[in-house]
C-alpha cells in the first residue's frame, strides 16, 4: 500500500527560490521561467545538442535526511526529440543520469564528481516532437527511483547531462513507512514517521476506508498515530458503511432484499416503507408503487405518497369589483402535509362569449401561487364581465404527474369599482376635485357624475357630468364645507359611487393649494 509521503525536497514548490549548483558554471544547466496554464513555472534546463562531448552537472542543495532510511525520488521532466533539430543534431542524446552523494555536512559550492554514485540513467517514456514543441504541449514524463539505506546526516542529488535537450520541472524527494493495518473499517498504509519532539513522538497518519465504507459527512476521518518504532497507536475518527451496506465484522455487506440503507451510518439496513416495492440486494432506496411518488426532499425512509384530490368545496362571493374565494382542504391529502393551492382566473365577455386569461389585469390579496390559506380576495375586476376562478390543490409530488386536481367557480361582475376621490386645489369660491378608477375598468365608463351640496343643506344639490378625471366646482360660498360624491356611468347604468367626501372652500384669500 502507498505509504504516507514525508517530503524532504520539492523543487516545484519552491518557485525558483532554490539556487542549485551548476558545473561548469555558466554553461549547461540553466534556471528558466516559463508560463504554463497562465502561471509562472520554473525549471532547470539544458539543450546543448550540437556541441558534442557534453558533461554538464546540476547539483541540489544539501538535503537533511531526517529519519529516512530509504528515499523516493520523483522526477518530472521533458525531453525533446533529437530528430526535431536540423540534421538530427548528431551528438544529441535523449537521456540523462541521476546521481546521489551522502555527507554529514554541507560542502557548499565545493563540487566533486567522484563523490557521487550513479542511481540510474533516466529515459523518457514520451519525447517532445516538433509539433508538440510548436503547440507548447509539454510531454511530461514522471520517473521514480528509490535509494537506500541511507546512513549519513544528509545527501545531495545530481543530474548529469551528456548532450540532451531536457528540462526538469519537478524534483521531489520523500520517504514513508509503518505496516499496513485494518482498524474500524479503515485501512492504514505503510508509513515512516519522525518524532516531532521528545514530548510528541508520534506522527498522525490518515487511513482509507475499506470497500463500501466512507467517512461520515461532517465527521472526522480515520486517523492513526505512527511511532518512530513503526507501531500504530490511538485510533481517531471512523469509517461507516456506505449507503446500501451494513457492518458485518470488519467489512461492509450489502443490504438483503426488502431492505435498504440510504446513507452512510452506523445503523443497520431498514425495511422498505409503505407504498414501495420490495428492493433488491444492496439497495440504497425502495422504489415507489405505481401511482405513488417521492418528492426530492422526502427522506427515503418515508412512505411514498401521491398528489391530493381537488379542493373539497369552493365558493365565490362577489363584492362590487372584488370577489372573495373560499374553499376547503381536499378529502384525500395523498398522505402528505405540504398541500398548497394555486388560483387562476379566466374572464369572458358576455356580448361575444370570447374568453381569455385575466392574470395580468386582476389583483390578488396575496400571491396566487403556493397559497397555504384556504381563501383569497381578487380585486380590479372589470364590470359586466363573467369570471371563472380555478383553485388547484398541489403537494410535494404533484409535479411528478401530468394530471391536476382542481375545482372551479364562476361569478359575474355588474358594477365598476367606486372612484377614489381627492381634493387637488381650492379657493374661496371653488374646489378642484380629481378621481381615479382601475385602468381595466376605464374603457367601460361613459361619463363621470359629480354630485355636490353644502353640508347641512338637504334640500338642494348640484350635478356635474364630465368625460375626464377632474372637475373644478365654481361659484361656491367662501369658508363653506361641501359634500362631494363621484359616480361612474356605464352604458349599462350607474357604477358604484365613491364615498361622500367633505371639502371646504377657503374663508379668505390665502394659499390656493392644499397638499393631499
Amino acid at each position: 500500500a502507498q505509504g504516507k509521503e514525508v517530503v524532504l525536497l520539492d523543487f516545484a514548490a519552491m518557485k525558483g527560490e532554490l539556487g542549485w549548483l551548476t558545473h561548469p558554471y555558466g554553461k549547461g544547466w540553466d534556471l528558466m521561467q516559463n508560463i504554463m496554464n497562465d502561471m509562472p513555472i520554473y525549471m532547470y534546463s539544458v539543450c546543448n545538442v550540437v556541441s558534442g562531448d557534453q558533461d554538464n552537472w546540476l547539483r541540489t542543495n544539501w538535503v537533511y535526511r531526517e529519519e529516512a532510511e530509504r528515499i523516493f525520488i520523483e522526477l518530472k521532466f521533458t525531453v525533446r526529440d533529437c530528430n526535431s533539430f536540423p540534421g538530427g543534431a548528431s551528438s544529441c542524446k535523449e537521456t540523462f543520469n541521476l546521481y546521489y552523494a551522502e555527507s554529514d555536512v554541507d560542502y557548499g559550492t565545493n563540487f566533486q564528481k567522484r563523490q557521487f554514485t550513479k542511481i540510474d540513467t533516466i529515459a523518457p517514456d514520451e519525447i517532445t516532437v516538433s509539433s508538440d514543441f510548436e503547440a507548447r504541449n509539454v510531454k511530461l514524463n514522471v520517473e521514480e527511483r528509490m535509494v537506500g539505506p541511507l546512513t549519513r546526516k544528509g545527501f545531495y542529488l545530481a543530474f548529469q547531462d551528456i548532450g540532451a535537450c531536457v528540462a526538469l520541472l519537478s524534483v521531489r524527494v520523500y520517504y514513508k513507512k509503518c505496516p499496513e493495518m485494518l482498524q474500524s473499517l479503515a485501512r492504514f498504509p505503510e508509513t515512516i514517521a519522525v518524532a516531532v519532539s521528545d514530548a510528541q513522538p508520534l506522527a498522525t497518519v490518515a487511513g482509507t476506508c475499506v470497500d463500501h465504507a466512507v467517512v461520515p459527512y461532517g465527521g472526522e476521518g480515520p486517523l492513526m498515530h505512527c511511532t518512530v518504532d513503526g507501531e500504530w497507536l490511538v485510533p481517531i475518527g471512523q469509517c461507516l458503511c456506505q449507503e446500501g451496506y451494513e457492518k458485518v465484522e470488519d467489512a461492509c455487506q450489502a443490504c438483503s432484499p426488502g431492505f435498504f440503507k440510504s446513507e452512510a451510518s452506523e445503523s443497520p439496513c431498514l425495511q422498505c416503507p409503505e407504498h414501495t416495492l420490495p428492493s433488491t440486494e444492496g439497495a440504497t432506496s425502495c422504489q415507489c408503487e405505481e401511482g405513488y411518488f417521492r418528492a426530492p426532499e422526502d427522506p427515503l425512509s418515508m412512505p411514498c405518497t401521491r398528489p391530493p384530490s381537488a379542493p373539497h368545496y369552493l365558493t365565490a362571493i362577489g363584492m362590487g369589483a372584488k370577489v372573495e374565494l373560499r374553499w376547503t382542504a381536499p378529502q384525500d391529502t395523498g398522505g402528505r402535509k405540504d398541500i398548497v393551492y394555486s388560483v387562476t382566473c379566466e374572464q369572458c365577455w358576455p356580448e361575444s362569449g370570447e374568453c381569455g386569461s385575466c392574470e395580468a389585469s386582476v389583483q390578488y390579496s396575496e400571491p396566487p401561487q403556493a397559497l397555504t390559506r384556504t381563501s383569497v380576495t381578487v380585486s380590479d375586476l372589470e364590470p359586466h364581465m363573467n369570471y371563472t376562478f380555478t383553485v388547484e390543490a398541489r403537494n410535494g409530488v404533484s409535479d411528478l404527474v401530468n394530471s391536476r386536481s382542481f375545482r372551479t367557480a364562476s361569478v359575474s361582475i355588474n358594477q365598476t369599482e367606486p372612484p377614489k376621490v381627492r381634493l387637488e386645489d381650492r379657493s374661496t369660491t371653488s374646489l378642484s376635485v380629481a378621481w381615479s378608477i382601475p385602468v381595466p375598468q376605464q374603457s367601460r365608463v361613459w361619463k363621470y357624475e359629480v354630485t355636490y351640496r353644502k353640508k347641512g343643506d338637504a334640500n338642494s344639490y348640484n350635478v356635474h357630468r364630465t368625460d375626464g378625471f377632474s372637475v373644478t366646482l365654481d361659484g361656491l360660498a367662501p369658508g363653506t364645507t361641501y359634500l362631494v360624491q363621484v359616480q361612474a356611468l356605464t352604458q349599462e347604468g350607474q357604477g358604484a359611487g365613491s364615498k361622500v367626501h367633505e371639502f371646504q372652500t377657503l374663508s379668505t384669500e390665502g394659499s390656493a393649494t392644499m397638499a393631499v
Epitope: 516559463n34 533539430f85 516538433s130
Partner: antibody
C-alpha cells in the same frame, strides 16, 4: 537556403484595402510559424501578426486587430496579410518572418516566438 | 503590453572596440529575449535568442546575457560589418514587443 519574398505592397488611399503575399522556398513551410513585422519609415520594428504552422492559432497586435487578417496556404508555400480600413499610420515596410522550432535549442518553447528568418520587405504607403 | 527600452539610442565606436548595448523590460521576461541586427534598407537578422544563445552562423564576438528585466548585447571586437542598428525583442508575451533600437556608428 531559406528564402522569403514579399509582394503586394503599393500606394493605397485611407480606408482602402491591400493584400500582401509572402512566397517561401528552401525549407518545409508547413513546419514554420510565420509572422508579419512592420517598420514605419525611419522608425523601429513593430510586430503585427502571427500564424501557427497549420493555420492556427493566430495573434494580432492591438493596433491592427479587427482590420488585418493573417492566413496561409501550405500547399502553395504562401503567407498572406489582408489589410482593410487602412490608415496613414499603417504606412511601413512589411516584413514576412518565420520561426522553426528545430532551430530553437531550448527544451521547452518560450511563451511566444522570435524570428529566425526574414524577407526583404514590401512598402505599403497609405496616403490620399 | 511589456515595454522594452534600449540604451543608448546611438553610439560611436571604432573597429576593435568592445561595445555593450542594454535592454530593459518593464516586467520580468525570464530569458525570453532575442537580439537582431539591421542594416539600412535591409531586413533584420537574428543574432541571439533566449538572452544568450547564439543563432547558427552568427560570429562568436556577439554575446548576450541577462535575465528578468536587465539584458545586454556585447560585441567583443567591433568589425566594419557590425555598424548597424540593433534591436531587442521580448517573446515572454503574445505582444512580442521590440526595443526602439540602438544605432552603432563609426567614430
Amino acid at each position: 537556403e531559406v528564402q522569403l519574398l514579399e509582394s503586394g505592397g503599393g500606394l493605397v488611399q485611407p480606408g482602402g484595402s491591400l493584400r500582401l503575399s509572402c512566397a517561401a522556398s528552401g525549407f518545409t513551410f508547413s513546419h514554420y510559424m510565420m509572422a508579419w513585422v512592420r517598420q514605419a519609415p525611419g522608425k523601429g520594428l513593430e510586430w503585427v501578426s502571427r500564424i501557427g504552422p497549420s493555420g492556427g492559432p493566430t495573434h494580432y497586435a492591438d493596433s491592427v486587430k479587427g482590420r488585418f487578417t493573417i492566413s496561409r496556404d501550405n500547399s502553395k508555400n504562401t503567407l498572406y496579410l489582408q489589410m482593410n480600413s487602412l490608415r496613414a499610420e499603417d504606412t511601413a515596410v512589411y516584413y514576412c518572418a518565420g520561426y522553426d522550432s528545430g532551430y530553437d535549442y531550448v527544451a521547452v518553447a518560450g511563451p511566444a516566438e522570435y524570428f529566425q528568418h526574414w524577407g526583404q520587405g514590401t512598402l505599403v504607403t497609405v496616403s490620399s | 503590453d511589456i515595454q522594452m527600452t534600449q540604451s543608448p539610442s546611438s553610439l560611436s565606436a571604432s573597429v576593435g572596440d568592445r561595445v555593450t548595448i542594454t535592454c530593459r523590460a518593464s516586467q520580468s521576461i525570464s530569458t525570453w529575449l532575442a537580439w537582431y541586427q539591421q542594416k539600412p534598407g535591409k531586413a533584420p537578422k537574428l543574432l541571439i535568442y533566449k538572452a544568450s544563445n547564439l543563432h547558427t552562423g552568427v560570429p562568436s564576438r556577439f554575446s548576450g546575457s541577462g535575465s528578468g528585466t536587465e539584458f545586454s548585447l556585447t560585441i567583443s571586437g567591433l568589425q566594419p560589418d557590425d555598424f548597424a542598428t540593433y534591436y531587442c525583442q521580448q517573446y515572454n508575451s503574445y505582444s512580442r514587443t521590440f526595443g526602439q533600437g540602438t544605432k552603432v556608428e563609426i567614430k
